[in-house]
Structures are given as C-alpha cells and as structure tokens.
C-alpha cells in the first residue's frame, strides 16, 4: 500500500505567438481544478479506460479574472497536494494523466458549467520511496510544470511498495528466514527473502531463495518479458533446452494465497481475496489484530486485541475486500446521467453535471417545468432552452422563495418613504411631489406639470404602487 | 467518523415557523448531497428535498415546495431545513441523509422530533 | 411523480426462516445506459434511524450481512433475508432514486 503524489507547480500560457490570455471564456470569471489519472503499464491507452491505479481530484482554485491589458500570468492553483492511494504493488511503470478543468463562474442555469482546457499524457518508470520528479509538459498552448513521487504506507516498504514489516510497537516475530527491514530498526519484513536480485515487480517466493515468476515474465530472476521468447501464447517457466516458454501453470494454478485466501487471475498477474485475520499480497501475515494497522484505505478496524479474535474492516466508500485493499472503480458504474462527468474523489463519487442539469446523478432537468413548482404563488414559464419562475408580488428569487423587500431599491423618489405593502410598496411623498413613486413635482399653485392625480388624492398623500 | 448530527426537538405553535439543523463532520461536505425526510408515525417516510451544498442549488418534492426551504452553509458544514405555517400534519420526525453519486442515502441523522400543538 | 409501493405490509417470521418482501414501482427504474435500477433498500429498527442495506438493486452495503439480498429489475424488486436472526426485527423501506426520491410505504418484520 502506499500513495502517488502530485505536486502542480504552475499552469499558464506556453511561450510563443498564439498563446492564450485567459483560461476562461468571453463568459466571465472562472477558476481550475485538476484531475489525475493513473493507469498501470507503458501502453497507450484509450482515453475513457479506467484509472486502474486510481485517480484524485484537486481542490477548486481561487476565481481567476481576466485583466486587459496586463500580461497573460501563470494562472491561481488549488491548494495541496494531489494523493491517489495505491493497495498492494506499486507498478513501477504506468501512465500519468493529468487533466486541467475550467469551472465557469457566469450565470449558467443550473450553476457552474466545467471544461476540460487541457489533457497531458506521460508515460513513466518510477521507483516508490525516491525523489520527486520534476516535469514540464506542453498541452496545445497550455504549458504544465509538475512534480509527482510514489511512497510507501502503513507497513510497506520497498521500491515496489511490496515488503511488509510489522509495525515498530508490535512484538518482533522475526523467524527463520525473516531479517530486519534495511531502513528500520526492530521491524522485520515478511514475505521470506528471495534470491538475490529477484525482481521486486515481477517475481516473489514463498522459500528463502527462489524466485518464482508472475505470468508474462520469465528467466532466473523473472527480469525477462515472456513475450521476447519465440514461443508465444504459452506461459509459465522457460523450458532449460529449447528458451521456449513450455505450458505451466496460470498464476492462480497450486493457489498461492496462503491460510485459505482465494485467488483470481488480473491482467499479468493474480489477486488473492484473504480472509479474516490474514492480509498482504499473498494473505501471508497472519496472528493481526486491530493493533497491527490491518485495515487500509482509511477502513475502520473492529475486533477484539487478543491475537485469537478475529478483526472486521469496515471499509470507507470506494474500497472493499476484507483489508479494504480493493479499490473499487466505481466510475465505470456510469452512474452520471445526461451526459455528466464522472469524478471519483476518493471518498465520495461526483458528477459534474452539464448545464441545465443537476441532482446526485444529473437526473434532474432544471429546463423544464414539468414537475417544478415555483414556490409561493409563482408560475413556471419556459423558454429558450432554460425555465424562471414569474414570482407573486413581495417574493423573488429563482424558485420564487426569497421574500422580496419592494423598499431595497429605494424606489420612492425626491426624498419620499417607502412602505412595504402585502401587494407591493406604498410612497409617503415629501412635500411639493406626487406619483405612485413620488416622480410628479407638484407646481407652487397645486396644479402638477404632469398627469393630475386621481380624484381623492392630494399631493403628497400616500400613493399605494400596484 | 461520518457524523450527521441534528439539533434538539423543538414544540411550536401552529403556524409558525421552525429552523432544524444538521451539521456534517467526517467527511467533505461539499462533495455530497444533503436531502431531508420527514417521518410521521405510520405514514412511512416522505422525501422533502435535496441541497447541494457546493452551489447551493435545492429541489423539492412539489408537495413540500410552499412549506419547506433548505440552506447550507459550508463554513459550518451545517444544512438547514425551514418549515413554516406548521399545522398539526407538520407534527413528524424529519431526518437528514447524506448522497453522493455512488451510495444513496448511506448516512442519517438521529432525526429532530417536531411537535406542532397549540 | 414515481410511486413505490410495497408488500406485504407486515409479516411474522420464526428465527432461521427465509423473507422474502416485495417492492414496485409505477415506471422502471432501469437506467438503459448503464442498464443499473435506480433503487435502494433500508432498514429501520425501532427508534433508530433508517439503515442504507442495499444499493444498485443488488449491491450489499459494506458491513450488512450476507443474509440479506436484493434483486429484481425494472419495476418489481425483491428483499431475502435468507435466515432470519432475533436482531432483523425492523421496518424495511425501499427507495427509487431515478427521479426525485420517494420510499415505499414499508414492511414491518416481526419475529414469532
């Protein structure tokens, strides 16, 4: 287990001619997030396959407007980190996406509008536990600098996030063929120490000193891609006599999930579902209670502290297994409606609705009437692809459940006092004025220069406005 | 922890004006949806509505459309649900619950008794 | 508006029998894109707050046990508890969540 970082730097305007002066539209002011996507293996992917390896979403970034005239900045950025939380393995090599998002702040019905401004695509080797990488990419016009590292979690360690040691405070255990993790006092490593430069990534042992190979990789320390053997389609160890790949066992074949775990074959490789009281690659660490960690991804552990009880993992949305070591790739649910983006966040799924839409899932139609009652007396009126509610006198706002002070925009004119009304607002004239809104200057003789006031009514006496 | 925790039971006369909260801890609350759910003894549960409290934006079940108005406010991670001109039927315990796009209502509050009586 | 009604309203049960409750909706609640039912189930002890058992129609919530089953597609769905335990004494509601949000009436579990 452990988490992918990424740390963006700056995103702005790339050099040379051409070059955009704002992120946002003609509409008005906006501001970025980011996504990060991250997909096992060095193959190009298609754009819409799953983040396998998971994905994060940034925080909104302060409103950025546009000023003429000043030159074109490196634009406002989310705070903080990036994080996607890896269980198991770290792969080594992968593919990095990272997504630039426009979220437009104009009047678009149904609130916000988002874009994606900018896409950039790399595909890397990274060792988890070492230095920050700094990148520079170019996306169109749009340039991105970026830096990103993998590190181990909780009892991981190793460049491959692979090792697992048992926490410092925990009694040392340390039996045969079990030696100290190199970076840590009184902590020791299971699983047994393979043979000497047996691939981390590809290879693993249940014996002190083999070197057992997962599917598609072969040789001594399982450091050759099978497919660069002249037999294809076979799989399992390389025949001594011919190089050739013979027919051996699928990775799941002689089960290498330890204490009853059951496995399933992946893509290159297996996954053991463990149970109760075992956990790790291969469900090899046993005698855990709560006090050892054995829940991840934030899961809450329950369980008794006696070595003999066994603990329960109540895993937070987005994880399941009996560690909570599954990531679950919920987006691929499509669970956004009308064309919604779908964004997972770790803890929680959200849907970038188009506009026009809203609710959990998009599937609510803010352009239509039907259904939607305008509150307090008001009637729904549609009309070029949007709908407002025409609210009932002293009330406003989109749904009509705002009470309007008819006084707030002081409509009472030369000096005259407004009077909220249950039908609207009354003017008490000053002196020498007239009118529903005090707009008529009365003439010294008591004739007005504009239309009489009705009969009853004298010069400064209240006018009720309708 | 998530927590959806509620404030106390309130006793109103009939046709006045109620304000119940529901402050959210936990988790993020701009990211879910906070909907409302009114429970009468034997009449099962009624939806009210929704907030989202990133924009603000609320729907309503139409019936609840004149009586109910919900609000948010994120500096507080704190839904508000407003009920006026409560007569006798208002008498319910309303319930608040969390959604994201995922789960649906995967977490409660205890729920606030209101008791409309002269 | 979609209107959820369920059956029976009540029933009573021996510990380690099997329930089953029914759910119905007024229009289906399958959504074609993705071909998931828009429908959740809950269970309400006595003076707690409801409990979210099932999603998706079919999915168990994270910590619910494994008696507990949903399914149906469209606009019939079913609730199993497979054996029942002395603790499943609830009301159990269903819930679409295709179109606005409206619960069925409920199924009241007694134990004999």
């Known amino acids: 287990a452990g988490v992918f970082e990424l740390q963006i730097h700056s995103f702005g305007p790339g050099p040379g001619p051409g070059a955009p002066r704002s992120p946002c539209s003609a509409r008005g002011p906006c501001r970025l997030f980011f996504r990060v996507c991250l997909k096992p293996g060095l193959s190009e992917e298609a754009a819409e396959s799953p983040c396998a390896l998971g994905a994060a979403l940034s925080a909104r970034g302060p409103v950025y407007t546009e000023q003429p005239e000043a030159p074109a900045p490196d634009l406002p950025l989310p705070n903080g980190l990036l994080q996607v939380p890896f269980r198991d393995a770290w792969p080594g090599t992968f593919s990095l996406i990272i997504e630039t998002w426009r979220e437009e702040l104009g009047d678009q019905i149904g609130g916000p509008a988002w874009s994606l401004l900018a896409r950039v695509t790399r595909r890397r080797r990274l060792a988890a536990g070492g230095p920050w990488a700094r990148d520079i990419q170019r996306a169109g016009a749009w340039e991105l600098r970026f830096s990103y590292r993998a590190r181990c979690e909780l009892l991981a360690v190793g460049t491959a996030c692979t090792r697992l040691c048992r926490p410092r405070s925990a009694p040392s255990r340390c039996g045969p063929g079990l030696r100290p993790c190199a970076p840590l006092e009184d902590e020791c490593e299971a699983p047994p120490v393979c043979r000497a430069g047996c691939s981390l990534e590809h290879g693993f042992c249940e014996q002190p000193g083999e070197c057992r190979c997962l599917e598609g990789w072969t040789g001594p320390l399982c450091t050759v891609p099978a497919s660069t053997s002249s037999c294809l389609g076979l799989r399992g160890p390389s025949s001594a006599t011919t190089g050739c790949l013979v027919p051996g066992p699928g990775p799941c074949d002689g089960n290498p999930c330890a204490n009853g775990g059951s496995c399933s074959e992946t893509p290159g490789s297996f996954e053991c579902t463990c149970p109760r009281g075992f956990y790790g690659l291969r469900c090899e660490v046993s005698g855990v209670t709560c006090a050892d960690g054995p829940c991840f991804n934030g899961g809450l552990c329950v369980g008794g502290a006696d070595p003999d009880s066994a603990y329960i993992c109540h895993c937070p949305p987005g994880f399941q297994g009996s560690n909570c070591e599954k990531r679950v790739d919920r987006c691929s649910l499509q669970p956004c409606r009308n064309g919604g983006l779908c964004l997972d966040l770790g803890h929680a799924l959200r849907c970038r609705c188009r506009a026009g839409f809203a609710g959990p899932r998009c599937e609510h139609n803010l352009d239509d009437c039907a259904g939607r009652a305008c509150a307090n007396g008001g009637t729904c009126v549609e009309g070029g692809g949007a709908h407002r509610c025409s609210c009932a006198l002293g009330f406003g706002g989109r749904d009509c459940r705002e009470r309007a002070d008819p006084c707030a925009a002081r409509p009472c004119a030369h000096g005259g006092r407004c009077y909220a009304h249950f039908s609207g607002l009354v003017c008490a004239c000053a002196p020498g004025y007239m009118g529903s809104r005090c707009e008529f200057p009365v003439h010294p003789d008591g004739v007005s220069a504009l239309p009489a006031a009705p009969p009853g009514l004298r010069p400064g006496d209240p006018q009720r406005y309708l | 922890e998530v927590q959806l925790q509620q404030s106390g039971a309130e006793l109103v006369r009939p046709g006045a004006l109620v304000k119940l909260s529901c402050k959210a801890s936990g988790f993020n609350f701009k990211d879910y949806y906070i909907h409302w759910v009114k429970q009468r003894p034997e009449l099962g549960l009624e939806w009210i509505g929704w907030?989202?409290?990133?924009?603000?934006?609320?729907i309503y079940d139409p019936k609840f459309q004149d009586k109910a108005s919900i609000t948010a406010d994120t500096s507080s991670n704190t839904a508000y649900l407003h009920l006026s001109s409560l007569t006798s039927e208002g008498t319910a315990v309303y319930y608040c619950a969390s959604e994201d796009a995922y789960y649906p209502f995967a977490y409660w509050g205890q729920g606030t008794l209101v008791t409309v009586s002269a | 508006d979609i209107v959820m009604s369920q059956s029976p309203s009540s029933l009573a049960v021996s510990v380690g029998e099997k329930v089953t409750m029914r759910c119905k909706s007024s229009q289906s609640l399958l959504y074609s894109s993705n071909q998931k039912n828009y429908l959740a189930w809950y269970q309400q002890k006595p003076g707690q707050s409801p409990k979210l058992l099932i999603y998706w129609a079919s999915t168990r919530e994270s910590g619910v046990p494994d008696r507990f089953t949903g399914s149906g597609s469209g606009t019939d769905f079913t609730l199993t508890i497979s054996s029942v335990k002395a603790e499943d004494l609830a009301v159990y509601f269903c819930?679409?969540?295709?179109?606005?949000?409206?619960f069925g009436g409920g199924t009241k579990l007694e134990i004999k």
């Open positions: 907030i989202d409290p990133e924009n603000g934006n609320a």
């Open positions: 819930q679409q969540y295709y179109s606005y949000r409206t």
